[in-house]
């Protein structure tokens, strides 16, 4: 059990498009056909203005026009949903396919790829039907484009809809040494395959992937729980060989000064093929990007029953410590360190700043009010709203 | 403030090695890498490689066989080493820091001053 | 690798003048550009990072866009101190690599 773990599943709340919690300043876009097709007529299911966002160029062959909805606040968007123009049955655009690109902080954007690296999502076949589209690796972002795209010069028109909820974690990235190969009847690919941050040679940095998507690995690390994947999928894992100082060291960044009480790590312990637990967890806090690691660090020396070869979430106690940086060197006990989850228990520091501060258009970073109205006391379920259940078979 | 203060020979013999420290101060090296990059009129700039502050280290493919890129985090110097240095090494070092957080992501921000590196008998 | 081609490779401007500058990626780097300045004698200064972003305190008059594979520099109205080269790195994957250069000389 992962407490305070966040289920992906559960993860699945209109976002305030259709509802109009997402207020019309905050979608924008690149351009617009006219004001009766702006950025604020882009709302699933509405019908104002002539029914959908159009741009007003070509989306062929250059794909550089774009429908933006700033949330405001880091959120994971599990799901998105398209319609074309409808306009009471006279509008005949839509759009066949289109891409996402998305942003935490407004500077930079990241396209979104499915776990085989396919960008492209189909869209529409007609303008009035809602086309659903699970999101695997779901996105943590604040700021989503839609990029339609057209095979022939065509007018394309869009409106849309975000599902998921907010990122309570916090996590804005993790550094960690890139995953590696372990070598057993079969190859087990143990990378980060949806990190979506730097890859410079050995090290990850920048971004979010598999260790914070939700996903807790099996027992069996060569299983997974997604379908046509390769062995060692829901993992990130790296050999002992690799690091004589006996430990893998990573780094976790967050949104703004945060009192953490743990660290949930889910681990594998199927130790028969060399996978253990670590031996110890070491961590250190800072409160800013340029300032010194204060006090002693945490060291966590993980007993229990080591022979019990089930994969397990290993609670790191971290004391309330106040910090925005955190690192952790995780020691090991065997030839292998493998992880599928890593994530946080901590409270916001009353008064802290945002992590990154001054202003971005369209809005500015965090803003210190409230969360929008929509969402409970827990910021994770909007009011009154069941999540979208994606019906089987349908078009993704 | 801010800076990386480069010290090296100006002269190197050919099949020699070239050894430059990269003195930081203003920062501490948690949250970066200190990226090498050369100089040359004939080739422009080349990335050489990089340390993070966890010791990790890339290198260029085509120099691996001869760089070597170290630390000594509590003085905050990085050593670089390259090995076998031939006429066409002949170029401007530099090292150049890039930061591993997002709160502080800009690309490479701060640059040493430059170690100009002849290589000749 | 991943091959940055820069054009031109010089560029005779007056005083105001607009300069654009163009850089070709060989494969996607999403937007995880950078710009530098070099002026003679000095090391380069970071001006644009992720294509489009100014770095503290460098002037409005340089704008960076593009995404993909294809990225602009732009000085709107050129001024004396920016008699310069520039050049364009990719930062998305090892090894980074950087543009030839763009040298701007006074017409």
């Known amino acids: 059990d992962m407490k305070g773990h966040f289920d992906p599943a559960k993860c699945r709340y209109a976002l305030g498009m259709q509802d109009r919690t997402i207020p019309d300043s905050d979608i924008s876009a690149s351009s617009s056909w006219s004001d009766s097709t702006a950025a604020r007529h882009s709302r699933l299911e509405s019908s104002d203005g002539d029914g959908a966002w159009c741009p007003a160029g070509s989306v062929f062959p250059k794909e550089e026009e774009y429908l933006q909805v700033d949330l405001q606040r880091l959120h994971l968007v599990a799901l998105v949903g398209t319609q074309g123009r409808h306009a009471g049955g006279l509008g005949k655009e839509f759009s066949r396919s289109y891409r996402l690109r998305y942003s935490r902080d407004g500077r930079r954007w990241m396209g979104w790829k499915d776990r085989w690296g396919q960008e492209v999502i189909s869209g529409n076949e007609d303008p009035e039907g809602v086309v659903l589209k699970d999101l695997g690796p779901p996105m943590v972002a604040r700021l989503v484009r839609f990029y339609p795209r057209a095979d022939r010069v065509m007018s394309v028109c869009l409106r849309v809809e975000l599902y998921g909820c907010l990122w309570r974690d916090g996590l804005l990235s993790y550094t960690a040494p890139v995953g590696q190969t372990m070598y057993l009847s079969e190859a087990v690919y143990l990378n980060d395959s949806t990190y979506d941050g730097h890859t410079v040679g050995g090290l990850q940095y920048g971004g979010l992937g598999q260790l914070a998507d939700g996903v807790v690995g099996l027992d069996d690390f060569r299983k997974s729980q997604e379908l046509r994947v390769w062995p060692g999928y829901d993992y990130v894992g790296w050999s002992n060989h690799s690091f004589s100082s006996g430990y893998v060291e990573m780094e976790f960044e967050f949104d703004r000064l945060r009192a953490f009480q743990a660290m949930q790590v889910h681990c594998n312990n199927m130790h028969t093929l060399g996978a253990r637990l670590p031996g110890g967890v070491e961590c250190r806090f800072r409160r800013g990007p340029a300032m010194a690691w204060e006090g002693e660090p945490m060291r966590h020396n993980l007993g229990g029953n080591l022979g019990d070869p089930r994969a397990r979430a290993v609670s790191v106690p971290l004391g309330g410590r106040v910090a925005r940086f955190l690192q952790c060197r995780f020691l090991f006990a065997g030839p292998w360190l493998l992880f599928s989850e890593i994530s946080f228990i901590s409270d916001v520091v009353n008064n802290s700043s945002p992590a990154l501060g001054g202003t971005f258009p369209p809005a500015p970073w965090w803003p210190p009010g409230p969360p929008p109205t929509n969402f409970s006391s827990l910021e994770l379920e909007p009011r009154g709203q069941q999540p979208v259940a994606k019906a089987e078979g349908s078009p993704t | 403030q801010v800076q990386l203060k480069q010290s090296g020979p100006g002269l190197v013999q050919p099949s020699q090695s070239l050894s430059i420290t990269c003195t930081v101060s203003g920062f501490s090296f948690t949250g970066y890498g200190i990226h090498w990059v050369r100089q040359s009129p004939g080739k422009g700039l080349e990335w050489l490689g990089v340390?993070?502050?966890?010791?990790?280290?890339d290198y260029n493919a085509a120099f691996i066989s001869r760089l070597s890129i170290s630390m000594d985090s509590s003085k905050g110097q990085v050593f670089f080493k390259m090995n076998s240095l031939q006429a066409n090494d002949t170029a401007i070092y530099y090292c150049?820091?890039?930061?591993?957080?997002?709160?502080?992501?800009?690309?490479?921000?701060?640059w040493g001053q430059g170690t100009s590196v002849t290589v000749s008998s | 690798s991943i091959v940055m081609t820069q054009t031109p490779k010089f560029l005779l401007v007056s005083a105001g003048d607009r300069v654009t500058i163009t850089c070709k990626a060989s494969?996607?780097?999403?937007?995880?550009v950078a710009w530098y300045q070099q002026k003679p004698g000095q090391s380069p200064k970071l001006l644009i990072y992720y294509a489009s972003n100014r770095y503290t305190g460098v002037p409005d008059r340089f704008t960076g866009s593009g995404y993909g594979t294809d990225f602009t520099f732009t000085i709107n109205t050129v001024q004396a101190e920016d008699l310069a080269v520039y050049f364009c790195?990719?930062?998305?994957?090892?090894?980074?690599?950087f543009g030839a250069g763009t040298k701007l000389e006074l017409k």
């Open positions: 790195q990719q930062d998305y994957t090892s090894p980074l690599t």
């Open positions: 340390i993070w502050s966890g010791g990790i280290t």
């Open positions: 494969q996607s780097v999403s937007n995880d």
């Open positions: 150049a820091r890039r930061s591993t957080t997002v709160v502080a992501d800009y690309a490479m921000d701060y």
